[in-house]
């Protein structure tokens, strides 16, 4: 039975040209995290595999940095980066958990972090 929950940074905003850390955290389960996929809509950004290391998609190599931890750092943000991001946790033996983050990239210098929220 899958008992875990994913906590994410929720709705976040950042300035154009800046950077942002996408972070998820899996709690309430003893399952082992074996791989985390980071996706934007249907596009793969990066994968962190506990045994194999990191893979960064070639199309994002210049703007994506692994970490911190299982998170992902997006750099040189553009307005086109606005949208939904998903952290997909592959665990053993539970299975797959998915978290959602919405990023808004702002032209102005007013960019505040939204509240954290949980996805069961």
């Amino acid at each position: 039975m899958m008992t875990g929950t994913i906590e994410t940074t929720g709705n976040i905003s950042a300035e154009k040209g800046g950077s942002i850390i996408l972070q998820c955290h899996l709690s309430s389960t003893t399952a082992q995290v074996t791989q985390v996929n980071w996706e934007q809509q249907d596009q793969l950004l990066a994968i962190c595999n506990a045994d194999l290391g990191w893979h960064i998609s070639p199309s994002f190599k210049d703007r994506v940095a692994p970490g911190p931890g299982l998170g992902l750092t997006l750099q040189s943000l553009t307005v086109n980066d606005t949208g939904e991001y998903f952290c997909i946790y592959h665990t053993y033996p539970d299975g797959t958990y998915t978290g959602r983050i919405f990023l808004e990239v702002l032209e102005s210098s007013v960019a505040e972090h939204g509240a954290r929220f949980q996805i069961p």
Epitope: I47, N49, A50, D51, L52, H55, Y92
Partner: antibody, heavy 125, light 107 residues
């Protein structure tokens, strides 16, 4: 290019423990970030994943076999091994060792990239 | 666990014809799907990974498509060496699971 070679007894008695070894050549098992896996294929049937061990030492087993399976790595011999206890005739199969994730860092996929030739194990008294 | 179902179990095709093999997952695997070819007495060989990318050295007549739960392996023009059994497999969720296989035989 890494190469794999299975070895072990071709005949095992019921209730005993099946022990197989996979010898890795063409590279060091200790400096490679892969999953080392065992897969089997009963005569005339399909493929069944038995289990894998990661470079961190983490093991992952097929739930249907978990209570009977142990996979380990011996870096000094550049080998990894499979032990399957309390065997019965239904464990008769060709056993393959394989490498999973050899191209993960470049291409981001996890699949069984490299296979050994397989070794036939018969369980019979 | 994710159950992989392949169809048909056997496909009879004439050399030079097109072969279309199907694989269905019991739940979404995104594009985390591989295809293998196995000839009698040999170990399986990786053909396709990531649902659609050919492995090194695999001829262009082999192509994969699909995502989520429905996947297809197409062999555009069957050569004599292509008559074999083909398996699909999902990854990364544990446990790794294979489909039951499709045997492509000469018509």
């Amino acid at each position: 290019q890494l190469q794999l070679q299975e070895s072990g007894p071709g005949l095992v008695k019921p209730s005993e423990t099946l022990s197989l070894t996979c010898t890795v050549s063409g590279g060091s098992i200790s400096s490679s970030r892969y999953y080392w896996a065992w897969i089997r294929q009963p005569p005339g049937k399909g493929l069944e994943w038995i289990g894998s061990i990661g470079t961190s030492g983490s093991t992952y087993y097929n739930p249907s076999l978990k209570s009977r399976v142990t996979i380990s790595v011996d870096t000094s011999k550049n080998q990894f091994s499979l032990k399957l206890s309390s065997v019965t005739a239904t464990d008769t199969a060709v056993y393959y060792c394989a490498i999973e994730g050899a191209n993960f860092r470049d291409f981001g996929y996890v699949a069984f990239d490299i296979w050994g030739q397989g070794t036939m194990v018969t369980v019979s008294s | 666990e994710i159950v992989m179902t392949q169809s048909p179990a056997t496909l009879s095709v004439s050399p030079g014809e097109r072969a279309t093999l199907s694989c269905r997952a019991s739940q979404s695997v995104s594009s985390n799907l591989a295809w293998y070819q196995q000839k009698p007495g040999q170990a399986p060989r990786l053909l396709i990974y990531g649902a659609s990318t050919r492995a090194t050295g695999i001829p262009a007549r082999f192509s994969g498509s699909g995502s989520g739960t429905e996947f297809t392996l197409t062999i555009s023009s069957l050569q004599s060496e292509d008559f074999a059994v083909y398996y699909c497999q999902q990854s990364p969720p544990w446990p790794r699971t294979f489909g039951g296989g499709t045997k492509v035989e000469i018509k």
